[in-house]
Interface confidence: low
């Protein structure tokens, strides 16, 4: 580390004095200090002498000696005061520029350390500092305004008390620049607008930034609109608002509106679309098929999308039958708004019961009139099967009735032994009935089919089983002939003897 002679931290001299500062290091050394007149520099290898024969207040400052070759970058410093009774301040710079929230050093150096007790910082023309100005003083460096704010961009003077009167420095202009994070923030409302020709409309374009220097304009289909601008300042941001008010819109007002704001950091733009229509409209649609099939006991949500202007004056779900006269519970109906002009209405039908099959209609009304969208809900049922023994045209016949939805298919099985259900090992014969007779097939009801199996002689140690199946499931009924007639076995439920 280099060494300075005289080896004191501070040196106080009078104007006109001779000052010699010598720096010695292991290698070559360099001096660094405030720019001031009358210094002579003499270097000789590992030493360097800084001297003046006529010190002035402008020589006041900190002189630092460094050794460029030192890998540790060590340095030594000495502060020189040239105490001039007429000049208590040496101002090193008349303009200081910092960004907001940085510390701003106003470099007025005190020329006499004795004066430190009576120093103060003021604004020019003796005006006091702004409230909340947090500052400190160092006789070596000057006044520091901590975490400077934009509003503190002012002209300042350093004041020292000399013989009972205040002596001011020359002024120092502080410029505190806003830290502009990017282009101004933008809002354009509404995001979408629909009006009927002749109605009033309002579009508001607003931009805000921490700095006042930004521009904002509203554009309609690439035409810049001349709109009086309202300006405001709150939450430490400058706000500029353009409000386009149209008392009676026409088709030429429709189109794309862009709100554009720019500053030194760049440009932001956001757009909305304004639609002008001849009259009120109301459109209902669904992404679902209007014909729905659901298994009994399961749940279903019916969804309708509504596009409307003006807004809906009424809407409801209605059950149109054909079963009970029940109506959907209001708590099961839900509405969500996608945006101003589009809504989704949902009817939740949990654990559907047989009586809830049928037509569900969503009705909506606005000044454009009524519209309705109707869903047809059919419930799916697994087949229910029953078998009876009868004589048709004198022939013994097994008659199987199966009801379910969708329409069940029927298969007959003949198997050995008496059993509730034929398994593969027991099966003697299988008959498929591709075209069972449809007994009933009404909308929203089960389909009932009938299949006949003509049996000349009933084998008593055998079982005849009618099986029916559809996409939901299957059902069966076992018929066991016994000497007294015949037994029928519905699966695991009850014994039936005709």
């Amino acid at each position: 580390i280099p060494v300075i002679e005289p080896s004191v931290p501070e040196l106080v001299v009078k104007p006109g004095a001779t000052v010699t500062l010598r720096c010695v290091g292991n290698g070559s050394v360099e001096w660094d200090g405030p720019p001031s007149p009358h210094w002579t520099l003499y270097s000789d290898g590992s030493s360097s002498i800084l001297s003046t024969n006529n010190a002035t207040f402008q020589n006041t400052g900190t002189y630092r000696c460094t050794e460029p070759g030192d890998p540790l970058g060590g340095s030594a410093a000495i502060h020189l005061y040239v105490k001039d009774p007429a000049r208590p301040w040496n101002v090193l710079a008349q303009e200081v520029v910092v960004f907001e929230d940085q510390d701003a050093l106003l470099p007025c150096l005190l020329t006499d350390p004795v004066l430190e007790a009576g120093v103060s910082l003021v604004r020019v023309r003796g005006r006091p500092l702004m409230r909340h100005t947090n500052y400190s003083f160092s006789p070596w460096h000057g006044f520091t305004i901590h975490r400077a704010k934009f509003i503190q961009s002012q002209d300042y003077q350093c004041s020292a008390l000399m013989g009972g009167r205040k002596v001011m420095s020359i002024s120092i202009r502080l410029k505190v620049q806003k830290v502009i994070p990017g282009p101004p923030a933008l809002t354009l409302v509404p995001a979408e607008l629909v009006r009927i020709r002749g109605e009033a409309a309002q579009i508001v374009c607003s931009a805000s930034s921490v700095d006042v220097n930004f521009d904002v304009f509203l554009q309609h289909n690439n035409t810049k609109l001349a709109i009086p601008q309202q300006s405001d300042f709150h939450n430490n941001r400058y706000q500029k608002v353009l409000t386009l008010n149209l008392d009676q819109v026409d088709f030429q007002h429709a189109g794309n509106y862009s709100c554009v704001a720019s500053n030194v950091q760049g440009k932001h733009s956001t757009s909305m679309f304004f639609r002008v229509v001849e009259s009120a409209y109301l459109n209902l649609s669904s992404e679902q098929n209007l014909i729905q099939e659901v298994t009994v006991g399961e749940g279903l949500n019916l969804k309708v999308m509504v596009e409307a202007y003006p807004g809906l004056q009424g809407f409801n779900w209605t059950y149109l039958g054909p079963f009970s006269d029940h109506q959907p519970e209001p708590k099961l109906a839900n509405a969500t708004t996608k945006d101003t002009y589009r809504h989704t209405f949902t009817l939740s039908l949990p654990r559907l019961k047989p009586s809830e099959a049928g037509r569900y209609s969503f009705l909506a009304r606005n000044p454009g009139g009524w519209r309705a969208l109707t869903f047809e809900l059919t419930l799916r049922y697994p087949p229910e099967v029953s078998v009876i023994w009868t004589f048709i045209n004198g022939s013994g016949t097994l008659l199987c009735a199966a009801s379910g939805y969708p329409q069940p298919n029927v298969t007959w099985l003949q198997c050995s032994g008496h059993t509730d259900r034929c398994d593969e090992a027991q099966v003697l014969q299988v008959w498929d009935d591709p075209y069972p007779e449809v007994l009933s097939q009404e909308p929203f009801h089960k389909v009932t089919v009938q299949s006949l199996l003509t049996v000349e002689t009933l084998e008593h140690n055998q079982t005849y089983e009618c099986r029916a199946h559809n996409s939901v499931g299957s059902g069966s009924w076992a018929f066991i002939p016994i000497s007294a007639g015949a037994h029928t076995h519905p699966p695991d439920e009850f014994l039936f003897t005709p």
């Epitope: 009033a200 035409t223 810049k224 609109l225 001349a226 709109i227 009086p228 409000t243 386009l244 008010n245 149209l246 008392d247 009676q248």
Partner: antibody, heavy 124, light 108 residues
Framework: QVQLVESGGGLVRPGGSLRLSCAAS????????MSWVRQAPGKGLEWVSA????????NYADSVKGRFTISRDNAKNSLYLQMNSLRAEDTALYYC?????????????????WGQGTLVTVSS | QAGLTQPPSVSVAPGQTARITCGGN??????VHWYQQKPGQAPVLVVY???DRPSGIPERFSGSNSGNTATLTISRVEAGDEADYYC???????????FGGGTQLTVL
Amino acid sequence: QVQLVESGGGLVRPGGSLRLSCAASEFTFDDYAMSWVRQAPGKGLEWVSAISWNGGSTNYADSVKGRFTISRDNAKNSLYLQMNSLRAEDTALYYCASTVEVAHRRLYKYLEVWGQGTLVTVSS
Amino acid sequence: QAGLTQPPSVSVAPGQTARITCGGNNIGSKSVHWYQQKPGQAPVLVVYGDSDRPSGIPERFSGSNSGNTATLTISRVEAGDEADYYCQVWDISSDHVVFGGGTQLTVL
């Protein structure tokens, strides 16, 4: 202080031409539409013509349509009125005025700042 | 195109209230603006958008507009208010600025 200064008026014979100018200072000229309004001696105000902020749209009173042309040069902060086929009834004090378009509640236009006017006399 | 009708003159004593009307078919659906013109001077905007005042215009000047009549009201009239007053609307269909014929206000 916002200022509009008209020039170019004078005495001209019927059928002749004149070009009026209006120089704007101390306001953002290209933010405003501009208008010309005239006032015949001892009479009321009569709107003559208007031009949008960028010159893209112009319109005229029926009494001058086809004879007068409004234009602007935003780089020079200047508004112009080229008057051809002048008639005795065009004799008037001609004012230029900054025109505010579109404000709250309704779509409307009003004339915010006026110049002192330049006199046009059409006489044989 | 709208036609605006103003009375040619209105007289009022100092300190009293002057009311200047501007008539037009359904003028209440438009915005009305008022200008003051003193002899030998350019017009000055005193009320815009029916009832708003530009900065620097005294609160004594106010406006209203409904139905077929717009009104400029000057309360506590002073000698310095003596001037011609013009109403103005913008005709949206023709895109023309339209002035009324003007009213001369005399302070007695």
